[in-house]
């Protein structure tokens, strides 16, 4: 007789990531009976929300429903009926809604309201949406790297089965770039964490980890440009800016009340004399490496060191994922190669910068201009961030991997969110059985 | 601003194939799905399906799946319709569109000027 | 699928008359878009989620409704309105349009 496949048991979980730019929708899924068995949930689809993200629809929530419904909808396709009412969501937002929620507890308030109404009217089982911290975002970011990595798994392997796999259990940190904040989260080598804000610990699959992380607000490449302009205007002559960070021949104008709009650039907050000002790039890698530092703050550390603006970090150790925009900046500039080294980084940087805006907009003719016109920055500001605000140095580079995605699911902290609050990472090894069960009869 | 520039009209026979394209400029074509809707002389209008350039995922409405295959050439900006074994009543306009929020979450809808199907022997 | 029934289907206002198009759904829909289609051109978004006009849409024009019952209501007709009309929903697929309200010349 023939062997039948029986149906499939398996689970599925959401996970909505709010974030500054953009809103994304993760299906995981994994087999039921293997739930605490590591590196069994895999993502299975992104669908990226069209539109800004959620703290832009401050002056109209009421449009909030229509903004998710598409993405909403593709879940409802792609998790089968049967699942739809035991499949959870959650909604975690960032560091846009961090800053909204500086600006106004209310306004947060209400847009997370509509949030969980319109996500309610769907027939999942909706957990809650919610502002997630920058320390839980550098953490799930660290378990969701190394989960997929299989770091947790206490089999050891001749072979290797992931990319980046170095055979030892040695854990990798994570280095997140978003819009609005950066996160670095890594293990010290035996070293204290001598700021408790910056210290987590851990028991995963029988094993402790004292990890350390921080979140920089208004570090992520969005807030980063506009803190950058609003510096750099504070001691313009008049009201042209002829800024290093963007190309020969690019211009913009800015309208002052925009600039002074995020909490990030209050520090900067003057009185000018005009109510807008022309962006004028001369393309300058160096130059615009130099604007960029001034944005660290590197003359105060209460500690035995730090990164910058006087927030402790332990030397680095190890190799590290770079992800989310980290990834997407570099991925673009070509430069996730693990064959790049630092200098050769530097010295594509310096050319790309040099390029003509109107050469530039030729050979791209598919990206929208507000993109195109910030990878210079961008590219230059994760330099910066990597060496000066990290400490990373030529040497240490090649221990940085861009990474977008690992086994297929994309590197991020919603799937270590996810797995947290589904209980699917135990503390304790789980008690390995002899037979896996046969999905067949 | 956005722009969707369609191919011109086309006249074919039963039976044949036909790829009509729509080239879109003036935004990021990975940020919106672009669908495409079919409107018969005189008649209503009615969703075909759409593809989402980011994900290169395709949806369709029942009535036009098979016969019908979206496309997208992300190099040149451009999404594709391709409609195998006419009939007469696939005689039409064919509008690709998109709608969305914009990066100050404007909401916006724009379409093509229409690709005229003719399919006559 | 979700059914879009819009009544009437045609109309003959006289200019400066109050208008009310009706759009019904077969099952509830979060919002309710509406476009202008006029001979020849392709359909323009006039009203979308429901109340909100899109951009240039003059103040006249007006929607409203929820569940399975939408209305656009024109307070004042003019000219320039005479046109097909169609509803839309965006809220499940396959997406779907009314078959029309045509606004004629009397």
């Known amino acids: 007789t023939q062997n039948k496949a029986l149906p499939e048991n398996v689970k599925y979980g959401i996970v909505l990531d709010a974030g500054s730019s953009h809103t994304s929708l993760y299906i995981y899924k994994w087999p039921a009976e293997k739930e605490n068995d590591t590196g069994v949930v895999h993502q299975v689809e992104e669908c990226r929300v069209k539109g800004p993200g959620i703290s832009k629809f401050v002056q109209k929530v009421n449009e909030i429903g229509i903004y998710l419904t598409d993405c909403m909808e593709r879940a409802r396709e792609v998790i089968p009926r049967s699942q739809h009412q035991e499949t959870p969501v959650y909604l975690g937002a960032t560091a846009g809604m961090r800053l909204l929620r500086m600006e106004s507890e209310e306004l947060a308030d209400r847009v997370l309201d509509v949030v969980e109404r319109s996500l309610s009217n769907y027939p999942f089982d909706f957990q809650g949406a919610r502002i997630i911290t920058g320390q839980e975002e550098g953490a799930y970011g660290w378990i969701t790297i190394n989960y997929l990595l299989g770091k947790f798994s206490q089999k050891t392997r001749w072979f290797s089965i992931v990319p980046y796999e170095t055979n030892n259990q040695e854990t990798f940190g994570a280095l997140d770039l978003g819009g609005a904040s950066t996160q670095v989260t890594f293990v010290p080598q035996n070293q204290t964490i001598e700021s408790p804000d910056n210290a987590l610990q851990f028991r995963l699959y029988g094993k402790d980890y004292n990890v350390y992380t921080h979140s920089f607000l208004c570090y992520g490449k969005d807030q980063a440009l506009w803190q950058k302009l609003a510096k750099d205007i504070q001691v313009a002559s008049n009201e042209i800016l002829r800024d290093p960070c963007f190309h020969p021949g690019y211009k913009k104008v800015v309208n002052v009340s925009d600039l002074y709009k995020t909490p990030c650039t209050k520090r900067f907050e003057m009185t000018l004399p005009f109510q807008q000002f022309e962006i004028q790039g001369i393309g300058n890698y160096q130059q615009c490496h130099q604007s960029i530092l001034e944005l660290f703050n590197t003359s105060y550390c209460p500690y035995s060191q730090c990164a910058f603006n006087g927030i402790f970090l332990p030397p680095l150790q190890g190799d590290f994922g770079a992800f989310s925009a980290f990834y997407f900046v570099m991925k673009f500039l070509n430069l996730t190669s693990e064959k790049v080294s630092q200098e050769k980084v530097t010295e594509m940087m310096k050319k790309f910068c040099a390029q003509p805006w109107e050469e530039i907009k030729t050979s791209y003719a598919g990206v929208k201009e507000k993109y195109l016109s910030e990878y210079c920055f961008s590219g230059t500001y994760i330099l910066s961030l990597l060496l000066q605000g990290y400490h990373f140095t030529a040497d240490s580079w090649e221990h940085i991997h861009f990474i977008g995605k690992i086994q297929g699911s994309d590197a991020g902290w919603t799937l270590g969110y996810m797995l947290n609050l589904t209980n699917m990472i135990p503390a304790e090894q789980p008690l390995s059985t002899p037979l896996s069960h046969s999905t067949y009869v | 601003e956005v722009q969707l520039l369609q191919s011109g009209p086309e006249v074919v026979k039963p039976g044949a194939t036909v790829k009509i394209s729509c080239k879109v400029s003036?935004?990021?074509?990975?940020?919106?799905?672009l669908n495409w809707v079919k409107q018969p002389p005189g008649k209503n209008l009615e969703w075909i399906g759409n593809i989402d350039p980011y994900s290169g995922g395709t949806r369709y409405n029942q009535k036009f799946k098979g016969r019908f295959t979206i496309t997208i050439d992300q190099s040149i900006n451009t999404a594709y319709m391709e409609l195998r074994s006419l009939t007469s009543e696939d005689t039409a306009v064919y509008y690709c569109?998109?709608?969305?929020?914009?990066?100050?979450?404007?909401?916006?809808?724009?379409w093509g000027q229409g690709t005229m199907l003719t399919v006559s022997s | 699928e979700i059914v879009l029934t819009q009544s009437p289907a045609i109309l003959s206002p006289s200019p400066g008359e109050r208008v009310t198009l009706n759009c019904s759904a077969s099952s509830s829909v979060s919002y309710m878009h509406w476009f202008q289609q006029k001979p020849g051109q392709a359909p323009r978004l006039w009203i979308y989620a429901t109340s909100n006009l899109a951009s240039g849409i003059p103040a006249r024009f007006s929607g409203s409704g929820s569940g399975t019952e939408y209305t656009l209501t024109i307070s004042r007709m003019e000219s320039e309105d005479f046109a097909v009309y169609y509803c839309q929903q965006r809220s499940s697929y396959p997406l779907t349009f009314g078959q029309g309200t045509k606004l004629e010349i009397k």
């Open positions: 569109g998109l709608y969305g929020y914009d990066d100050d979450a404007n909401y916006f809808d724009d």
């Open positions: 003036g935004y990021s074509f990975t940020d919106y799905n």
